[in-house]
């Protein structure tokens, strides 16, 4: 069944003398593997022999033997699906029909492939898009219906005979569907490419020319224009005439409309290639161009700047910047419409000519209040001198000047007084709108620039005010010089540095932190009694009787201030010791007797020792010695010793008499 054989390959292959041909081919024989393959050139079926006649280019048999002369033709296929062939080199007389005679065990098939071999390399074919427009990227394609592994070729693009700078992408196809070599070139044509010759050149591996295809590019573009003007420099005076001509150097397709524009705006009723301007005025100065349109769009010429010359117009002054801040820089610009531009300027300040100022700009690097006023100017060019315009006002702004803080009170000011201050200044621009005071306090401002301090403190030393507009100017601080009685009076012990012991030399100092006025007097007092009028109170040898509460007073012309009471403490060893007896120095036996060691000591006695009439110490160490029950044997003289941190003291002897009770006497 012949329908079992399915072949796929290009219908026709193209080559030229001396090149090669590669025939991609696949097949399918359903009944088994290929057993025999013959490649015929122009095969014809012979009905008599039931075989094909024709030149056998290639033959493979079951034993696999191939005649040596068949090396030009190669069967690159296999026994079940690949039937690819190669002929290298290929000759002109190979043109015609190739017949692939295939035989399997039970089936036979003849497959025909057309081969077209030309005498010389045939040209590639350039494919262009249907329309090419300037600045729009296009792809030029060069296609050659040839590709063969054994014969490398290259396609090169030329523009006007010169290799094109743009990189081309070359691709090849050697498939059962198609055989070709293709080069694609992307480029953005400009209007000047219109009419230019593009060539795709086929070359061999060594770059030798084989053939080419050529096209002339048809690039659609907006009209390209040149503008000509008489006079050529486009500089005229008022009343002169000007002619402008618009030339179309290229347009594709043909142009349809013409118009003229001045400063980007279309001029009415000007639709020819010539623009005639008669008796021009200065208003006709500007940038002119012609615009010509075609189906692609409008094209514009370069602009011609028409300058109509005239004498300067009345000038105006522009100030950068007003109001100006004192100390800043200011620039004045004299503006006057004129053509040609003014060459000389005269400047006026408050109507008076400013000497040495002849430039368009006046620059004042450091503005001062006196620079304020009206500035005007006059411009001059070759055609004449302009008029002085209205001028511009320079407002110079500055912080308040000569700010002072003034005390309104009679002097001196005493602590607790109400003080009124005012903030004064000499001049200000803009006006003063507020005031500030230092230091800040909960003070009244009864009116703008006035400060009232109720119950002024002793420590209100200085006050400063600021007058403020856009800026604040501070006055120098003013001293209130508040007078007050001495402050922080206190007693301070100068010597000894440690605690005071009886017999020490002692100095007490009367201290105070401040006093205004400074001249002061001192007074020392103990228990309401005046002791001295010096800043120091001295004791050559202190005695416990000097202990007590001391105060010192400091006074000035404003008043006097007392210190807190200061306690003078004198430390001494126990003294004036005596032994007291309770209930008395005569006690009946069996009763209770308490002996107490009384003393005067600072600090108090910390340790007591009791002695009997034999100066024998008793095992008792408290202040009281309790004898209970008392015995007659306890009779005798007793004394005590007291000890503190300063020293020891002893009492004189005190005699205790213990007498017999009536019971004892009764027993006797």
């Amino acid at each position: 069944d012949s329908s079992k054989w399915v072949f796929e390959h290009p219908e026709t292959l193209y080559a030229w003398e001396g090149a090669c041909v590669w025939i991609p081919c696949t097949y399918r024989a359903l009944d088994g593997d290929l057993e025999s393959f013959i490649l015929f050139h122009n095969p014809e079926y012979n009905k008599n022999t039931s075989k094909f006649d024709g030149t056998r280019l290639y033959e493979s048999t079951k034993d696999g033997k191939v005649p040596s002369e068949q090396k030009r033709v190669q069967f690159l296929g296999d026994k079940n699906k690949n039937c690819t062939l190669s002929i290298h080199p290929v000759h002109l007389n190979d043109s015609g029909q190739l017949g692939l005679r295939m035989e399997s065990k039970t089936e036979k098939w003849m497959e025909r492939i057309h081969l077209n071999v030309s005498e010389r390399p045939f040209p590639p074919h350039i494919q262009l898009p249907p329309e090419i427009q300037e600045s729009q990227e296009v792809t030029l394609t060069c296609l050659l219906n040839f590709s063969c592994y054994g014969y490398p070729i290259q396609l090169q693009w030329l523009l006007e005979g010169v290799p094109m700078r743009q990189a081309a992408v070359t691709s090849t196809s050697l498939t059962i569907k198609s055989v070709f070599t293709r080069s694609e070139l992307k480029f953005s044509p400009q209007w000047s490419h219109h009419g230019k010759i593009v060539t795709c050149q086929l070359q061999d591996a060594d770059g030798k020319f084989l053939s080419n295809d050529t096209v002339q590019l048809n690039v659609k573009h907006t009209p390209k224009l040149e503008i000509k003007v008489t006079p050529s420099d486009a500089i005229v005076r008022e009343g002169d005439s000007v002619t402008m001509t618009c030339e179309v150097s290229s347009s594709n397709p043909e142009y349809t409309t013409v118009s003229w524009l001045k400063d980007g705006t279309s001029l009415k009723k000007q639709n020819t290639f010539t623009l005639n301007l008669r008796e021009v005025t200065k208003d006709q100065s500007g940038k002119y161009c012609c615009q010509v349109s075609n189906d692609v769009g409008p094209g514009r010429s370069e602009e011609v700047f028409l300058q109509v010359q005239y004498a300067p117009e009345p000038s105006t002054v522009q100030i950068l910047h007003s109001p100006a801040v004192e100390g800043s820089q200011v620039e004045f610009l004299c503006m006057s419409l004129a053509n040609p531009l003014p060459t000389n300027y005269t400047w006026y300040h408050n109507g008076k000519e400013m000497q040495g100022r002849t430039e368009e700009k006046v620059h004042i690097p450091k503005i001062l209040p006196w620079h304020a006023g009206t500035y005007s100017c006059v411009a001059e060019n070759i055609l004449g001198t302009g008029q002085r315009g209205p001028g511009a006002e320079l407002d110079v702004q500055y912080p308040p000047k000569k700010v002072t803080t003034v005390i309104q009170n009679p002097m001196p000011i005493r602590e607790g007084d109400t003080v009124t201050l005012s903030c004064n200044y000499n001049s200000s621009n803009p006006s003063v709108t507020r005031y500030e005071w230092k230091p800040h306090g909960a003070w009244e401002e009864p009116s703008l620039g006035v400060l009232k301090i109720q119950n002024v403190g002793w420590d209100n030393t200085t006050i400063a005010c600021a007058a403020c507009n856009s800026w604040c100017s501070w006055a120098s601080p003013v001293a209130l010089n508040v007078q007050y009685a001495p402050r922080d009076v206190r007693v301070r012990k100068i010597k000894p540095l440690s605690e005071i012991h009886s017999g020490n030399s002692v100095s007490l100092q009367c201290d105070f932190s401040s006093s205004h006025p400074k001249e002061v007097q001192f007074f020392w007092e103990k228990n309401g009694r005046l002791l001295g009028k010096e800043s120091q109170l001295n004791f050559d040898s202190i005695s416990p009787e000097d202990a007590g509460s001391y105060s010192c007073w400091v006074n000035n012309s404003i008043g006097q201030t007392a210190s807190k009471a200061w306690t003078l403490e004198v430390l001494y060893a126990p003294r004036r010791l005596r032994v007291s007896m309770s209930p008395g120095d005569q006690v009946m036996e069996g009763k209770s007797a308490t002996l107490t060691c009384e003393s005067d000591a600072n600090p108090p006695v910390s340790h007591y020792t009791w002695f009997d009439w034999n100066n024998q110490s008793l095992p008792y160490h408290s202040q009281k010695l309790r004898l209970e029950p008392v015995k007659v044997q306890h009779s005798g003289a007793y004394w005590c010793q007291g000890t503190n941190s300063v020293g020891k003291g002893r009492s004189p002897l005190s005699t205790l008499t213990v007498y017999y009770s009536p019971e004892t006497i009764g027993r006797r």
């Epitope: 000047s192 219109h194 009419g195 230019k196 060539t199 295809d213 050529t214 002339q216 048809n218 290229s250």
Partner: antibody, heavy 116, light 112 residues
Framework: QVQLVQSGAEVKKPGASVKMSCKAS????????LHWVRQAPGQRLEWMGY????????EYNQNFKDRATITADTSASTAYMELSSLRSEDTAVYYC?????????WGQGTTLTVSS | DIVLTQSPDSLAVSAGERVTMNCKSS????????????LAWYQQKPGQPPKLLIY???TRESGVPDRFSGSGSGTDFTLTISSVQAEDVAIYYC????????FGGGTKLEIK
């Protein structure tokens, strides 16, 4: 070699039309534009327009766009120029020409005489 | 269109003399892609089509005697015949082909 062979001389009356031909050989006809140039007696050469045989695109000198029609028959490698509404000032020699990158090829010219 | 103005209109020189003729373009004919000036010079004798002498402003066509030379760039071009021969009597045209085609008015060369 490249050759442009033009049709023979023509005599026409004012108001009539004329169609002259230019047969190209020796190159691929569709690869190059074909221009028409005329020269009136004692006058300068005057470009009339061209055709791109590849796509029949034409472009004309503004002076001729209403009266001249350029066409091409690629199968015959021939270009044609028809001029209508003839007037006496159309009396001239009409040339077809084409440019290659480094040269120009001109036909021998067709003489048109317009006379009543 | 680009306008070409030739000067002088005509000139008469003795054989062997050097002659120059000018062609001024209203716009540049320099093509930026290859830096060539798209200007050609032709010689035309009565009853003959124009004969190409120079292309790209300065390249001599093969077969043209080397006494013919072209120069210039942009908008101003010159054709020089270094030693005029009797057979050089003709009208010489300049031709721009950068954009469409335009021709100069021609310069007529005569021998005294």
């Amino acid at each position: 070699q490249v050759q442009l062979v033009q049709s023979g001389a023509e005599v026409k009356k004012p108001g009539a039309s004329v169609k002259m031909s230019c047969k190209a050989s020796g190159y691929t006809f569709t690869s190059y534009w074909l221009h028409w140039v005329r020269q009136a007696p004692g006058q300068r050469l005057e470009w009339m327009g061209y055709i791109n045989p590849r796509n029949d695109y034409t472009e004309y000198n503004q002076n001729f766009k209403d009266r001249a029609t350029i066409t091409a028959d690629t199968s015959a490698s021939t270009a044609y120029m028809e001029l209508s509404s003839l007037r006496s000032e159309d009396t001239a020699v009409y040339y077809c020409a084409r440019r290659d990158i480094t040269t120009f090829y001109w036909g021998q010219g067709t003489t048109l005489t317009v006379s009543s | 269109d680009i306008v070409l103005t030739q000067s002088p209109d005509s000139l008469a020189v003795s054989a062997g003399e050097r002659v120059t003729m000018n062609c001024k373009s209203s716009q540049s004919v320099l093509y930026s892609a290859n830096h060539k000036n798209y200007l050609a010079w032709y010689q035309q004798k009565p009853g003959q089509p124009p004969k190409l002498l120079i292309y790209w402003a300065s390249t001599r066509e093969s077969g043209v005697p080397d006494r013919f030379s072209g120069s210039g760039s942009g908008t101003d071009f010159t054709l020089t015949i270094s030693s005029v021969q009797a057979e050089d009597v003709a009208i010489y045209y300049c031709h721009q082909y950068l954009s469409s085609w335009t021709f100069g008015g021609g310069t007529k060369l005569e021998i005294k």
